[in-house]
């Protein structure tokens, strides 16, 4: 029998050390412009100089110094438009996943000092310049106020802000979360005369309340209004205000599509189409039917009119509308017509261009493979990603569509340009597509460089991170495979990483890393020096991601196969591969682990629990355990209701706790934050309970005062050190 | 032309209640906020209440919140206020008048109410 | 709540002459949101200066609005007869919306 040992053969290179991942000493850098004109765009420099640069000119020069910066111990920045004013961000206070608060100071550039005067509150929810001249709007204490200039008193727009009960222009916790995925919920016009913006109503939301105990001698507790599955939503409205008369005719309310306002619905998102031409997208709280709708301001009346003619409906017959997030319109020049993804006739995400109706939608993109995002539409370009190349779905090129021409001509713009190094990219344009920086993730490392728009041509290396690979030079990296496995006319995607000196005559133990929540991608073309990189590395792990039904960019059917029936078929899809693994000669059957966080800790508990013996150990982190313990957006887009006449039986029967009994024969490791905000410390309390009921051993390890991602330093070094010593143990690894 | 005109004043007790229209003519009505603007016998002008076009945000002044509401029904094209828990320092002609915090551009005529014993 | 105080009180001129109202308020308001208004005995108040001291529609040009800040001057360059009544300052940036106690100009 092939030996099980597996030691690491005589090299000058060292392996990976678990120090070196904690202290992050091989991480990367990328490089994104931050495009203030055609041709000139700003950036922060290693030392904190804000730099403008002129890419016809070549002309370079520092327009705020590290020591402005400094003076107020600013961490980030942003230039008023008419380029008279920077704001200055510090005091960073992180809130939720993309929320936080930070004081702001303006500094004029021209009389090179901070404005006295009227200065802003603090602590702010979200500042913004408008995209002419130098008005901002602030969000501050739930409500919204404007300022002409940087130096008049504001005007406040809203006044029914509440903490916890009404927020204006930001988002409330789910709809931040699992709808927006932004700080914000406004949007100026793009002449800097109208302001959009969301007031959420959450009186009507039940409260999660966990402790955060902090140094005090009593815990404070955290209150957060958290609709879960089936519970009341938060009531929405948009309203949209004229800022140069702000105080004549008040916020304008623009209507709800009588199709969406019959019942329950959610706003998905707002797109400026033209100074006095917005579109709003909906979503009925089931979400498969999304209506996007155009609105136009009547001069005439001063008020917004959404025609039934401009509404556009968007429905899915085999799951739910859109991907993770229902695609948003990319208008062309003519303010009427724009470009859109969304599923063709035969289930893949598709460029289509709609001019009319969805009815008589021109597709654009076609083939078994999905458009991905729509970069910019110019004149005669459009620019969007896509993993058609070579027909791997983990790939992303950028491509561009010249629309001037009939029929409208395809060129990759990525393909064929260091091939081998890159094979996910994304793209930063500057305004009408002049120029544009092209990032590089992967699979070597990654590499930004800015292009010419209209040849293509590569103008410069932005950063090709020579630090990285210098210092990875006498590191013993493992070696990654993407490849693909069939089982039963399905086809799996996975990645995986091999020990150095990899040798299949000899047999080596498994992790399956997993996370394969709907519409999600592990096995992705990207770099990485991570935890399990390490673990490839020094401790001879062999190392597996599969991206299993459910997942994204491979079509509807396999997306939508887990549609009303979370923790199925993403479970069985993971046992499949495992198996598959096995016959592959290489895997010690009996080291088998499995770990998985968020979505992949529900996956793995699972998958632990399917009683099949596949596994000797695993470790959920932050784990779902009950789709009735999630976010009613969340669970109810992929679950539906938990109410008898819809999918309640489901519900119950996917719980991790209804496994309990399963979990006697592997080693369990169960961790999770208790001040986590998303996936509450309730999942993992409810699993130990369920254990402890059933008798069952387990080990469980618990983070205070963490969130969801238990990110603080010292946790996480105590987080991978904890993982590594339970896997060590369960793999009979010496330490 | 744009035409504003109250109704509803008159006399009434200490703790009674009135209820005041303003009809509206000349402009589309459900497009713009408007608000309700007072004066004393022999005195200044005092803004009570605003309501936004479509009806969905209301604002009092603190004088009369908690006692007055302000509606509209944009389908009959007015205003409205009802006055509740009316006191001796509410007498005053009540004016409605075209927009929210300023630009009162548009006025009514005005209709007196009298608040006493 | 922001202040408005009109001063003078009464301002006695005659015909042809040039009336300068002032206006201050407690705290700043800039020009963007100060308005002044016209009555007349027994008739509702009349919108003069709008927006950033623009005059309103069917104003004449001998109103004119000035100031920024805390301190706000309407000027009319030439005294019409029919220009004799009260006028208010208001404040529209700051809820609760206010006015000044009034300016009489009266025929002296």
């Known amino acids: 029998r092939p030996s099980r040992v597996y030691k690491p053969e005589g090299n000058t290179k060292r392996a990976l050390t678990l120090k070196d991942i904690l202290n992050g000493t091989f991480s990367y850098k990328t490089y994104f412009p931050n495009w203030i004109s055609e041709q000139e765009y700003l950036h922060q420099s290693e030392d904190d100089n804000i730099v403008f640069y002129n890419i016809e000119t070549r002309e370079s020069y520092i327009i705020l110094s590290n020591s402005t910066m400094k003076s107020v111990n600013a961490t980030d920045y942003g230039l008023s438009p008419d380029r008279q004013f920077v704001y200055l961000e510090s005091d960073y206070s992180k809130l939720w996943r993309y929320s936080y608060t930070a004081t702001y100071y303006i500094y004029d550039l021209q009389n090179g000092e901070f404005v006295r005067g009227y200065e802003l509150p603090r602590p702010i929810q979200y500042l913004c310049w408008s995209p002419v001249g130098s008005k901002l709007a602030y969000v501050y204490q739930n409500n919204i106020y404007l300022k002409q200039r940087p130096g008049d008193p504001p005007f406040q727009i809203t006044y029914t802000g509440r903490e916890n009960r009404i927020f204006n222009g930001i988002p409330d916790w789910v709809y931040e979360e699992e709808m927006l995925a932004t700080k914000y919920a406004l949007w100026w016009s793009p002449d800097g005369k109208f302001l959009a913006y969301v007031e959420f109503n959450d009186s009507d939301i039940p409260i999660i309340a966990y402790s955060y105990y902090g140094d005090g001698q009593y815990p404070r507790t955290i209150n957060i209004p958290y609709p879960k599955a089936g519970a009341k939503n938060p009531v929405v409205r948009v309203f949209i205000v004229d800022t140069t008369y702000p105080h004549h005719v008040g916020p304008m309310e623009v209507p709800v599509p009588e199709m969406i306002a019959s019942s329950d619905y959610y706003f998905s998102w707002l797109t400026w189409v033209s100074s006095e031409r917005v579109c709003l997208q909906w979503l009925k709280r089931v979400q498969n039917v999304s209506v996007l709708s155009i609105c136009d301001f009547r001069e005439d009346w001063h008020a917004w009119e959404c025609p039934k003619n401009q509404e556009h409906v968007e429905e899915s017959r085999t799951g739910w509308a859109g991907g993770f997030f229902v695609s948003t319109p990319a208008f062309s020049q003519d303010a009427t017509s724009y470009y859109k993804i969304f599923s063709d006739k035969d289930g893949y995400k598709h460029i289509h261009y709609i001019k009319d109706t969805v009815e008589n939608a021109i597709q654009i993109t076609s083939g078994k493979w999905e458009a991905i995002y729509i970069f910019r539409v110019t004149q005669d370009s459009l620019f969007y990603s896509s993993n058609e190349f070579e027909g791997y779905p983990g790939r992303r090129n950028i491509y561009r569509i010249s629309i001037g021409n009939s029929p409208p001509s395809k060129k990759c713009v990525t393909c064929h340009l260091r091939k081998e190094r890159c094979q996910y990219y994304t793209a930063s344009f500057s305004y009408k597509a002049k120029y544009y920086a092209l990032v590089c993730y992967g699979p070597g490392l990654p590499i930004s460089t800015l292009h010419d728009g209209r040849t293509d041509q590569e103008i410069q290396v932005l950063e090709e991170n020579k630090e990285l690979e210098n210092s990875l030079r006498n590191i013993q990296l493992p070696k990654v495979e993407i490849k693909k496995l069939k089982d039963g006319g399905l086809t799996f995607w996975y990645k995986m990483i091999l020990p150095p000196q990899f040798d299949r005559s000899k047999k080596y133990p498994l992790l399956i890393q997993v996370y394969g929540g709907p519409c999600s991608q592990s096995v992705k073309s990207v770099f990485a020096v991570n935890w399990i990189t390490y673990l490839a590395s020094k401790e001879g792990i062999v190392i597996a991601l599969v991206d299993g039904r459910g997942t994204a960019f491979q079509g509807d059917k396999f997306l939508h196969a887990v549609y009303r029936k979370l923790g199925v078929y993403e479970v069985e899809d993971q046992l499949t591969a495992v198996r598959k693994f096995i016959e592959m000669g290489f895997i010690d059957e009996e080291r088998i682990a499995i770990w998985g966080w968020s979505y992949g800790g529900y996956v793995s508990s699972l998958a632990l629990a399917s009683g099949t013996g596949l596994f000797k150990c695993g470790i959920a982190v932050a784990p779902v355990s009950s789709w009735e313990y999630y976010a009613s957006i969340y669970s109810e887009r992929f679950m539906g209701l938990p109410t008898k006449d819809d999918n309640l039986e489901h519900y119950k029967n996917s719980t991790v706790m209804a496994r309990a009994e399963y979990f006697r024969n592997v080693d369990y490791l169960l961790i999770h934050g208790t001040a986590d905000d998303n996936v509450h410390f309730q999942n993992s309390a409810q699993i130990a309970k369920a254990l402890v009921n059933a008798q069952v051993d387990f080990q469980a390890m618990w983070y205070s005062d963490q969130n969801h991602g238990i990110s603080s330093g010292r946790s996480q070094n105590h987080l991978y050190t904890h993982m590594t010593h339970f896997l060590k143990q369960c793999f009979s690894l010496s330490d | 032309e744009v035409q504003l005109l109250e109704s509803g004043g008159g006399l009434v007790q200490p703790g009674g209640s009135l209820r005041l229209s303003c009809a509206a003519s000349?402009?589309?009505?459900?497009?713009?906020?408007m608000s309700w603007v007072r004066q004393a016998p022999g005195k200044g002008l005092e803004w009570v209440s605003a309501?936004?076009?479509?009806?969905?945000?209301?604002y009092y002044a603190d004088s009369v919140k908690g006692r007055f509401t302000i509606s509209r029904d944009n389908s009959k094209n007015t205003l409205y206020l009802q006055m509740n828990s009316l006191r001796a320092e509410d007498t005053a002609v009540y004016y409605c008048?075209?927009?929210?915090?300023?630009?009162?551009?548009?006025w009514g005529q005005g209709t007196l109410v009298t608040v006493s014993s | 709540e922001i202040v408005l105080t009109q001063s003078p009180g009464t301002l006695s001129l005659s015909p042809g002459e040039r009336a300068t109202l002032s206006c201050r308020a407690s705290?700043?308001?800039?020009?963007?949101?100060l308005a002044w208004y016209q009555q007349k005995p027994g008739q509702a108040p009349r919108l003069l200066i709008n927006?950033?001291?623009r005059r309103a529609t069917g104003i004449p040009d001998r109103f004119s609005g000035s100031g920024s800040g805390t301190d706000f001057t309407l000027t009319i360059s030439r005294l019409e007869p029919e220009d004799f009544a009260v006028y208010y300052c208001?404040?529209?940036?700051?809820?609760?919306?206010?006015f000044g106690q009034g300016t009489k100009v009266e025929i002296k």
């Open positions: 008048a075209k927009g929210w915090f300023g630009g009162f551009n548009y």
């Open positions: 000349g402009f589309t009505f459900s497009s713009y906020a």
């Open positions: 309501i936004i076009g479509s009806g969905g945000i209301t």
């Open positions: 705290q700043s308001v800039t020009s963007s949101y």
């Open positions: 927006v950033g001291s």
């Open positions: 208001q404040q529209g940036i700051m809820l609760p919306p206010t």
